[in-house]
Protein backbone atom coordinates (compact mmCIF):
# COMPACT_ATOMS: atom_id res chain seq x y z
CA UNK A 1 0.00 0.00 0.00
CA UNK A 2 1.31 3.44 -0.93
CA UNK A 3 1.50 6.43 1.44
CA UNK A 4 -1.82 7.61 -0.04
CA UNK A 5 -3.37 4.26 0.88
CA UNK A 6 -3.67 3.11 -2.73
CA UNK A 7 -2.97 -0.50 -3.60
CA UNK A 8 0.11 -0.69 -5.82
CA UNK A 9 1.77 -3.58 -7.60
CA UNK A 10 5.02 -4.24 -5.83
CA UNK A 11 6.88 -7.32 -6.93
CA UNK A 12 9.97 -8.49 -5.11
CA UNK A 13 12.87 -9.24 -7.48
CA UNK A 14 12.88 -12.94 -6.65
CA UNK A 15 9.18 -13.23 -7.43
CA UNK A 16 9.60 -11.16 -10.57
CA UNK A 17 12.32 -13.52 -11.73
CA UNK A 18 10.15 -16.54 -10.99
CA UNK A 19 7.39 -15.38 -13.34
CA UNK A 20 9.60 -14.83 -16.36
CA UNK A 21 8.08 -16.80 -19.20
CA UNK A 22 7.73 -16.18 -22.93
CA UNK A 23 4.34 -17.60 -23.85
CA UNK A 24 3.05 -17.90 -27.41
CA UNK A 25 -0.58 -18.91 -27.84
CA UNK A 26 -1.24 -20.67 -31.14
CA UNK A 27 -4.91 -20.37 -32.05
CA UNK A 28 -6.82 -22.38 -34.62
CA UNK A 29 -8.91 -19.78 -36.44
CA UNK A 30 -10.36 -22.09 -39.09
CA UNK A 31 -14.03 -21.96 -40.04
CA UNK A 32 -15.18 -24.77 -37.76
CA UNK A 33 -14.42 -22.93 -34.50
CA UNK A 34 -17.75 -21.66 -33.17
CA UNK A 35 -18.58 -19.46 -31.37
CA UNK A 36 -15.41 -17.39 -31.59
CA UNK A 37 -16.49 -15.37 -28.55
CA UNK A 38 -15.73 -18.45 -26.45
CA UNK A 39 -12.14 -18.34 -27.66
CA UNK A 40 -11.72 -14.67 -26.78
CA UNK A 41 -13.36 -15.30 -23.39
CA UNK A 42 -10.85 -18.08 -22.78
CA UNK A 43 -8.00 -15.78 -23.78
CA UNK A 44 -9.30 -13.06 -21.47
CA UNK A 45 -9.60 -15.39 -18.48
CA UNK A 46 -6.16 -16.88 -19.06
CA UNK A 47 -4.36 -13.62 -19.75
CA UNK A 48 -5.83 -11.71 -16.80
CA UNK A 49 -4.13 -14.21 -14.49
CA UNK A 50 -0.75 -13.26 -15.89
CA UNK A 51 1.65 -10.61 -14.69
CA UNK A 52 2.65 -9.28 -18.10
CA UNK A 53 5.58 -7.00 -18.66
CA UNK A 54 9.03 -6.77 -20.25
CA UNK A 55 10.66 -8.18 -17.11
CA UNK A 56 7.86 -10.55 -16.21
CA UNK A 57 5.75 -12.76 -18.44
CA UNK A 58 5.44 -11.87 -22.12
CA UNK A 59 2.67 -13.13 -24.37
CA UNK A 60 2.40 -13.36 -28.15
CA UNK A 61 -0.49 -14.74 -30.17
CA UNK A 62 -0.37 -16.55 -33.51
CA UNK A 63 -3.51 -17.53 -35.42
CA UNK A 64 -3.58 -20.18 -38.10
CA UNK A 65 -5.98 -21.88 -40.44
CA UNK A 66 -4.82 -22.27 -44.01
CA UNK A 67 -2.13 -19.64 -43.38
CA UNK A 68 -0.50 -18.16 -40.30
CA UNK A 69 -0.79 -14.64 -38.87
CA UNK A 70 1.12 -13.07 -35.99
CA UNK A 71 -1.65 -11.28 -34.09
CA UNK A 72 0.91 -9.66 -31.83
CA UNK A 73 4.51 -10.27 -30.84
CA UNK A 74 5.88 -11.13 -27.41
CA UNK A 75 7.25 -7.62 -26.94
CA UNK A 76 4.28 -5.73 -28.37
CA UNK A 77 2.57 -4.96 -25.05
CA UNK A 78 4.08 -4.20 -21.67
CA UNK A 79 1.13 -4.73 -19.33
CA UNK A 80 -1.66 -7.21 -18.72
CA UNK A 81 -4.23 -4.50 -19.42
CA UNK A 82 -2.79 -3.75 -22.87
CA UNK A 83 -2.70 -7.43 -23.79
CA UNK A 84 -6.29 -7.93 -22.66
CA UNK A 85 -7.48 -5.08 -24.87
CA UNK A 86 -5.54 -6.45 -27.86
CA UNK A 87 -6.73 -10.04 -27.33
CA UNK A 88 -10.38 -8.94 -27.23
CA UNK A 89 -9.94 -7.46 -30.72
CA UNK A 90 -8.68 -10.66 -32.31
CA UNK A 91 -11.18 -11.91 -34.86
CA UNK A 92 -11.36 -15.32 -36.43
CA UNK A 93 -9.51 -15.24 -39.73
CA UNK A 94 -11.09 -18.41 -41.04
CA UNK A 95 -9.76 -20.89 -43.54
CA UNK A 96 -10.96 -24.12 -45.08
CA UNK A 97 -7.91 -26.02 -43.86
CA UNK A 98 -6.39 -26.54 -40.42
CA UNK A 99 -2.61 -26.35 -40.77
CA UNK A 100 -1.65 -27.06 -37.16
CA UNK A 101 1.90 -28.18 -37.93
CA UNK A 102 2.46 -24.97 -39.86
CA UNK A 103 1.03 -22.89 -37.00
CA UNK A 104 3.33 -24.53 -34.47
CA UNK A 105 6.35 -24.36 -36.75
CA UNK A 106 5.78 -20.69 -37.51
CA UNK A 107 5.49 -19.96 -33.80
CA UNK A 108 8.76 -21.80 -33.17
CA UNK A 109 10.68 -20.25 -36.06
CA UNK A 110 9.26 -16.74 -35.91
CA UNK A 111 7.30 -15.90 -32.75
CA UNK A 112 10.07 -17.11 -30.46
CA UNK A 113 12.80 -15.02 -32.10
CA UNK A 114 14.56 -12.15 -30.36
CA UNK A 115 13.36 -9.87 -33.16
CA UNK A 116 9.79 -10.51 -31.98
CA UNK A 117 10.66 -10.11 -28.32
CA UNK A 118 11.81 -13.53 -27.10
CA UNK A 119 14.36 -13.20 -24.31
CA UNK A 120 17.54 -15.22 -24.08
CA UNK A 121 17.48 -17.69 -21.21
CA UNK A 122 13.75 -17.31 -20.55
CA UNK A 123 11.62 -20.43 -20.66
CA UNK A 124 9.51 -20.78 -23.81
CA UNK A 125 5.93 -21.97 -23.53
CA UNK A 126 3.51 -22.67 -26.37
CA UNK A 127 -0.23 -23.12 -25.87
CA UNK A 128 -1.97 -24.70 -28.88
CA UNK A 129 -5.76 -24.49 -29.14
CA UNK A 130 -7.48 -26.39 -31.96
CA UNK A 131 -10.82 -27.99 -32.80
CA UNK A 132 -9.93 -30.53 -35.46
CA UNK A 133 -7.43 -32.86 -37.05
CA UNK A 134 -4.84 -31.01 -39.07
CA UNK A 135 -4.51 -31.32 -42.82
CA UNK A 136 -0.73 -31.28 -42.38
CA UNK A 137 -0.53 -33.84 -39.59
CA UNK A 138 2.03 -35.78 -41.62
CA UNK A 139 4.43 -32.89 -40.78
CA UNK A 140 3.84 -32.92 -37.01
CA UNK A 141 6.59 -35.36 -36.05
CA UNK A 142 9.29 -33.06 -37.38
CA UNK A 143 7.68 -29.92 -36.01
CA UNK A 144 7.33 -31.36 -32.51
CA UNK A 145 10.90 -32.67 -32.58
CA UNK A 146 12.10 -29.20 -33.57
CA UNK A 147 10.22 -27.74 -30.59
CA UNK A 148 11.78 -30.35 -28.33
CA UNK A 149 15.23 -29.47 -29.61
CA UNK A 150 14.57 -25.84 -28.67
CA UNK A 151 13.12 -26.72 -25.25
CA UNK A 152 9.72 -25.26 -26.00
CA UNK A 153 7.17 -26.54 -23.47
CA UNK A 154 3.87 -27.28 -25.17
CA UNK A 155 0.35 -27.32 -23.75
CA UNK A 156 -2.28 -28.54 -26.20
CA UNK A 157 -6.03 -28.11 -25.99
CA UNK A 158 -8.46 -30.15 -28.07
CA UNK A 159 -11.92 -28.63 -28.50
CA UNK A 160 -14.30 -31.48 -29.27
CA UNK A 161 -17.25 -29.26 -30.19
CA UNK A 162 -17.43 -29.89 -33.93
CA UNK A 163 -16.95 -33.64 -33.38
CA UNK A 164 -19.68 -33.81 -30.75
CA UNK A 165 -22.03 -31.69 -32.85
CA UNK A 166 -21.55 -34.07 -35.78
CA UNK A 167 -21.51 -37.27 -33.68
CA UNK A 168 -18.02 -38.04 -34.97
CA UNK A 169 -15.35 -40.14 -33.32
CA UNK A 170 -12.80 -38.00 -31.49
CA UNK A 171 -10.21 -40.75 -31.14
CA UNK A 172 -7.85 -39.76 -33.97
CA UNK A 173 -8.16 -36.08 -33.16
CA UNK A 174 -7.39 -36.56 -29.47
CA UNK A 175 -4.44 -38.78 -30.34
CA UNK A 176 -3.04 -36.09 -32.63
CA UNK A 177 -3.41 -33.26 -30.12
CA UNK A 178 -1.93 -35.42 -27.36
CA UNK A 179 1.11 -35.97 -29.58
CA UNK A 180 1.65 -32.20 -29.67
CA UNK A 181 1.76 -31.85 -25.88
CA UNK A 182 4.99 -32.06 -23.91
CA UNK A 183 5.49 -34.98 -21.59
CA UNK A 184 4.06 -35.96 -19.19
CA UNK A 185 1.04 -35.72 -21.47
CA UNK A 186 -1.49 -35.81 -18.62
CA UNK A 187 -0.11 -32.49 -17.35
CA UNK A 188 0.14 -30.79 -20.75
CA UNK A 189 -2.93 -31.99 -22.65
CA UNK A 190 -6.50 -30.79 -22.14
CA UNK A 191 -9.73 -31.55 -23.94
CA UNK A 192 -13.03 -29.74 -23.62
CA UNK A 193 -16.46 -30.81 -24.81
CA UNK A 194 -17.04 -27.61 -26.76
CA UNK A 195 -15.84 -24.04 -27.22
CA UNK A 196 -17.93 -22.74 -24.30
CA UNK A 197 -16.15 -25.15 -21.94
CA UNK A 198 -12.74 -23.60 -22.65
CA UNK A 199 -13.09 -21.31 -19.64
CA UNK A 200 -13.37 -24.33 -17.32
CA UNK A 201 -9.72 -25.28 -17.84
CA UNK A 202 -8.22 -21.81 -17.40
CA UNK A 203 -7.36 -22.15 -13.71
CA UNK A 204 -5.63 -25.52 -14.09
CA UNK A 205 -3.86 -24.48 -17.28
CA UNK A 206 -2.61 -21.29 -15.67
CA UNK A 207 -1.34 -23.19 -12.63
CA UNK A 208 0.49 -25.71 -14.78
CA UNK A 209 2.08 -23.04 -16.95
CA UNK A 210 3.42 -21.15 -13.96
CA UNK A 211 4.47 -24.35 -12.22
CA UNK A 212 7.13 -24.55 -14.94
CA UNK A 213 9.02 -21.77 -13.16
CA UNK A 214 8.48 -23.07 -9.65
Amino acid sequence: VSPTFQVVNSIAPVQECSTQLDIVIVLDGSNSIYPWDSVTAFLNDLLERMDIGPKQTQVGIVQYGENVTHEFNLNKYSSTEEVLVAAKKIGRRGGLQTMTALGIDTARKEAFTEARGARRGVKKVMVIVTDGESHDNHRLKKVIQDCEDENIQRFSIAILGSYNRGNLSTEKFVEEIKSIASEPTEKHFFNVSDELALVTIVKTLGERIFALEA
Epitope: Q97, L102, D136, K142, Q145, D146, E148
Partner: antibody
Framework: QVQLQESGPGLVKPSQTLSLTCTVS??????????WSWIRQHPGKGLEWIGY???????YYNPSLKSRVTISVDTSKNQFSLKLSSVTAADTAVYYC?????????WGQGTTVTVSS | EIVLTQSPGTLSLSPGERATLSCRAS???????LVWYQQKPGQAPRLLLY???SRATGIPDRFSGSGSGTDFTLTISRLEPEDFAVYYC?????????FGGGTKVEIK
Amino acid sequence: QVQLQESGPGLVKPSQTLSLTCTVSGGSISRGNYYWSWIRQHPGKGLEWIGYIFYSGSTYYNPSLKSRVTISVDTSKNQFSLKLSSVTAADTAVYYCARDGYGMDVWGQGTTVTVSS
Amino acid sequence: EIVLTQSPGTLSLSPGERATLSCRASQSVSSSYLVWYQQKPGQAPRLLLYDASSRATGIPDRFSGSGSGTDFTLTISRLEPEDFAVYYCQQYGNSPLTFGGGTKVEIK
Protein backbone atom coordinates in the same frame (compact mmCIF):
# COMPACT_ATOMS: atom_id res chain seq x y z
CA GLN B 1 27.80 -32.91 -45.87
CA VAL B 2 24.95 -35.41 -45.96
CA GLN B 3 24.89 -37.83 -48.89
CA LEU B 4 22.38 -40.51 -49.85
CA GLN B 5 23.02 -43.67 -51.85
CA GLU B 6 20.39 -46.08 -53.14
CA SER B 7 21.21 -49.75 -53.59
CA GLY B 8 19.30 -52.85 -54.67
CA PRO B 9 18.64 -55.06 -57.66
CA GLY B 10 18.11 -53.34 -60.99
CA LEU B 11 15.87 -56.09 -62.31
CA VAL B 12 12.81 -57.53 -60.58
CA LYS B 13 10.38 -60.14 -61.92
CA PRO B 14 6.66 -59.35 -62.14
CA SER B 15 4.65 -60.24 -59.00
CA GLN B 16 7.82 -60.18 -56.89
CA THR B 17 8.86 -57.61 -54.28
CA LEU B 18 11.14 -54.72 -55.13
CA SER B 19 13.59 -54.00 -52.29
CA LEU B 20 15.82 -50.93 -52.11
CA THR B 21 18.00 -49.48 -49.38
CA CYS B 22 19.17 -45.91 -48.91
CA THR B 23 22.37 -45.40 -46.95
CA VAL B 24 22.85 -42.03 -45.29
CA SER B 25 26.39 -40.76 -44.80
CA GLY B 26 27.74 -37.54 -43.35
CA GLY B 27 24.93 -37.21 -40.82
CA SER B 28 22.71 -39.20 -38.51
CA ILE B 29 19.32 -40.45 -39.60
CA SER B 30 18.33 -40.21 -35.93
CA ARG B 31 18.41 -36.43 -35.94
CA GLY B 32 14.72 -35.80 -35.76
CA ASN B 33 14.53 -32.83 -38.07
CA TYR B 34 13.92 -34.72 -41.30
CA TYR B 35 11.69 -37.22 -42.98
CA TRP B 36 13.40 -39.82 -45.17
CA SER B 37 11.60 -40.15 -48.47
CA TRP B 38 11.24 -42.40 -51.47
CA ILE B 39 10.27 -40.90 -54.83
CA ARG B 40 10.12 -42.50 -58.23
CA GLN B 41 10.17 -41.28 -61.82
CA HIS B 42 8.78 -43.32 -64.66
CA PRO B 43 10.78 -43.17 -67.93
CA GLY B 44 10.36 -39.73 -69.50
CA LYS B 45 7.74 -38.77 -66.93
CA GLY B 46 7.34 -36.66 -63.79
CA LEU B 47 8.03 -37.35 -60.13
CA GLU B 48 5.82 -39.43 -57.83
CA TRP B 49 6.11 -39.45 -54.04
CA ILE B 50 5.99 -42.98 -52.64
CA GLY B 51 6.20 -42.19 -48.94
CA TYR B 52 8.48 -41.25 -46.09
CA ILE B 53 9.55 -42.31 -42.62
CA PHE B 54 10.56 -40.46 -39.47
CA TYR B 55 13.51 -41.75 -37.46
CA SER B 56 11.09 -43.01 -34.79
CA GLY B 57 9.52 -45.35 -37.36
CA SER B 58 6.34 -43.38 -38.15
CA THR B 59 5.47 -43.84 -41.81
CA TYR B 60 3.39 -41.90 -44.30
CA TYR B 61 2.51 -43.39 -47.68
CA ASN B 62 0.96 -42.29 -50.93
CA PRO B 63 -2.56 -43.81 -50.83
CA SER B 64 -2.19 -44.93 -54.45
CA LEU B 65 0.62 -47.30 -53.40
CA LYS B 66 -0.13 -47.82 -49.71
CA SER B 67 -1.37 -51.41 -50.01
CA ARG B 68 1.94 -52.48 -51.57
CA VAL B 69 4.50 -50.28 -49.83
CA THR B 70 6.55 -50.71 -46.67
CA ILE B 71 9.20 -48.21 -45.63
CA SER B 72 11.41 -49.06 -42.66
CA VAL B 73 14.38 -47.52 -40.90
CA ASP B 74 17.48 -49.00 -39.29
CA THR B 75 19.08 -46.24 -37.24
CA SER B 76 22.00 -48.45 -36.20
CA LYS B 77 23.04 -48.80 -39.85
CA ASN B 78 21.96 -45.27 -40.78
CA GLN B 79 19.74 -46.70 -43.50
CA PHE B 80 16.12 -46.68 -44.56
CA SER B 81 14.49 -49.11 -46.96
CA LEU B 82 11.66 -49.47 -49.44
CA LYS B 83 9.72 -52.60 -50.21
CA LEU B 84 7.14 -52.60 -53.01
CA SER B 85 5.23 -55.83 -53.41
CA SER B 86 3.41 -57.41 -56.38
CA VAL B 87 5.30 -55.36 -58.93
CA THR B 88 4.28 -55.02 -62.57
CA ALA B 89 5.86 -53.39 -65.59
CA ALA B 90 4.19 -50.14 -64.47
CA ASP B 91 6.62 -50.03 -61.52
CA THR B 92 9.61 -49.71 -63.86
CA ALA B 93 11.18 -46.39 -62.90
CA VAL B 94 14.15 -44.57 -61.44
CA TYR B 95 13.81 -44.72 -57.66
CA TYR B 96 15.26 -41.91 -55.56
CA CYS B 97 15.70 -41.55 -51.83
CA ALA B 98 15.73 -38.04 -50.39
CA ARG B 99 15.92 -36.08 -47.17
CA ASP B 100 12.85 -33.95 -46.53
CA GLY B 101 12.97 -30.95 -44.21
CA TYR B 102 11.45 -27.91 -45.87
CA GLY B 103 11.34 -29.60 -49.22
CA MET B 104 13.68 -32.37 -50.35
CA ASP B 105 17.08 -30.79 -50.06
CA VAL B 106 19.33 -33.86 -50.43
CA TRP B 107 18.77 -36.62 -52.99
CA GLY B 108 20.44 -39.86 -53.91
CA GLN B 109 21.58 -40.18 -57.51
CA GLY B 110 18.73 -42.61 -58.22
CA THR B 111 18.67 -46.25 -59.17
CA THR B 112 16.87 -47.69 -62.19
CA VAL B 113 14.60 -50.64 -61.48
CA THR B 114 13.18 -52.61 -64.39
CA VAL B 115 10.32 -55.02 -63.90
CA SER B 116 10.55 -57.77 -66.47
CA SER B 117 10.48 -61.54 -66.68
CA GLU C 1 -5.22 -35.08 -53.44
CA ILE C 2 -3.95 -31.71 -54.61
CA VAL C 3 -3.23 -31.66 -58.34
CA LEU C 4 -0.51 -29.27 -59.48
CA THR C 5 -0.67 -28.17 -63.10
CA GLN C 6 2.41 -26.57 -64.60
CA SER C 7 2.44 -24.41 -67.68
CA PRO C 8 3.68 -24.12 -70.27
CA GLY C 9 4.79 -27.70 -70.85
CA THR C 10 7.80 -26.43 -72.81
CA LEU C 11 9.36 -22.98 -72.86
CA SER C 12 11.76 -22.19 -75.72
CA LEU C 13 14.02 -19.27 -74.85
CA SER C 14 17.50 -17.92 -75.50
CA PRO C 15 20.24 -17.36 -72.90
CA GLY C 16 19.82 -13.97 -71.25
CA GLU C 17 16.04 -14.02 -71.59
CA ARG C 18 13.57 -14.07 -68.71
CA ALA C 19 11.67 -17.28 -67.96
CA THR C 20 8.32 -17.30 -66.19
CA LEU C 21 6.95 -20.69 -65.11
CA SER C 22 3.50 -21.22 -63.65
CA CYS C 23 2.22 -23.75 -61.13
CA ARG C 24 -1.52 -23.88 -60.44
CA ALA C 25 -3.02 -25.96 -57.62
CA SER C 26 -6.44 -27.62 -57.66
CA GLN C 27 -7.05 -26.24 -54.18
CA SER C 28 -5.38 -23.68 -51.96
CA VAL C 29 -1.82 -24.46 -50.87
CA SER C 30 -0.03 -22.62 -48.08
CA SER C 31 2.97 -20.87 -49.60
CA SER C 32 5.05 -22.31 -46.73
CA TYR C 33 4.46 -25.74 -48.25
CA LEU C 34 5.29 -24.98 -51.88
CA VAL C 35 8.72 -25.80 -53.31
CA TRP C 36 10.44 -25.76 -56.70
CA TYR C 37 13.04 -28.17 -58.11
CA GLN C 38 15.32 -28.21 -61.13
CA GLN C 39 16.20 -31.47 -62.86
CA LYS C 40 18.75 -32.02 -65.59
CA PRO C 41 18.88 -35.17 -67.75
CA GLY C 42 20.33 -38.15 -65.90
CA GLN C 43 20.44 -36.28 -62.60
CA ALA C 44 18.36 -36.16 -59.45
CA PRO C 45 16.20 -33.09 -58.86
CA ARG C 46 17.76 -30.17 -57.00
CA LEU C 47 15.85 -28.01 -54.52
CA LEU C 48 15.67 -24.41 -55.75
CA LEU C 49 13.07 -22.64 -53.63
CA TYR C 50 11.13 -23.45 -50.47
CA ASP C 51 8.34 -21.45 -48.79
CA ALA C 52 7.43 -20.54 -52.41
CA SER C 53 10.05 -17.79 -52.51
CA SER C 54 13.07 -18.61 -50.29
CA ARG C 55 16.18 -19.71 -52.15
CA ALA C 56 17.80 -22.95 -51.03
CA THR C 57 21.49 -22.97 -50.13
CA GLY C 58 23.73 -22.14 -53.08
CA ILE C 59 20.92 -21.11 -55.44
CA PRO C 60 21.75 -17.92 -57.39
CA ASP C 61 19.54 -14.87 -56.98
CA ARG C 62 18.37 -14.95 -60.60
CA PHE C 63 15.88 -17.57 -59.35
CA SER C 64 12.86 -16.12 -57.57
CA GLY C 65 9.43 -17.33 -56.61
CA SER C 66 6.11 -15.76 -55.79
CA GLY C 67 2.45 -16.56 -55.39
CA SER C 68 -0.11 -17.73 -52.87
CA GLY C 69 -3.31 -19.73 -52.72
CA THR C 70 -3.58 -21.62 -55.97
CA ASP C 71 -1.19 -19.70 -58.23
CA PHE C 72 2.58 -19.80 -57.94
CA THR C 73 5.34 -18.58 -60.23
CA LEU C 74 9.02 -19.37 -60.66
CA THR C 75 10.99 -16.65 -62.44
CA ILE C 76 14.51 -16.91 -63.84
CA SER C 77 15.52 -13.31 -64.49
CA ARG C 78 18.29 -13.99 -67.03
CA LEU C 79 18.75 -17.50 -68.34
CA GLU C 80 22.25 -18.93 -68.12
CA PRO C 81 23.26 -21.92 -70.26
CA GLU C 82 23.14 -24.18 -67.17
CA ASP C 83 19.52 -23.23 -66.47
CA PHE C 84 18.08 -25.21 -69.37
CA ALA C 85 16.38 -28.09 -67.60
CA VAL C 86 13.00 -29.34 -66.35
CA TYR C 87 11.41 -27.52 -63.42
CA TYR C 88 8.92 -29.07 -61.00
CA CYS C 89 6.74 -27.53 -58.32
CA GLN C 90 5.72 -29.62 -55.33
CA GLN C 91 3.37 -29.19 -52.38
CA TYR C 92 3.84 -30.97 -49.08
CA GLY C 93 1.12 -29.43 -46.91
CA ASN C 94 -1.44 -32.10 -47.75
CA SER C 95 -0.88 -35.82 -48.00
CA PRO C 96 -0.11 -37.26 -50.46
CA LEU C 97 2.75 -34.98 -51.38
CA THR C 98 2.34 -34.12 -55.04
CA PHE C 99 4.48 -32.76 -57.87
CA GLY C 100 3.51 -30.80 -60.92
CA GLY C 101 4.05 -32.39 -64.33
CA GLY C 102 7.07 -30.19 -65.01
CA THR C 103 8.03 -27.40 -67.40
CA LYS C 104 10.92 -27.99 -69.78
CA VAL C 105 13.01 -24.88 -70.45
CA GLU C 106 14.86 -25.50 -73.71
CA ILE C 107 17.25 -23.47 -75.83
CA LYS C 108 15.51 -21.67 -78.68
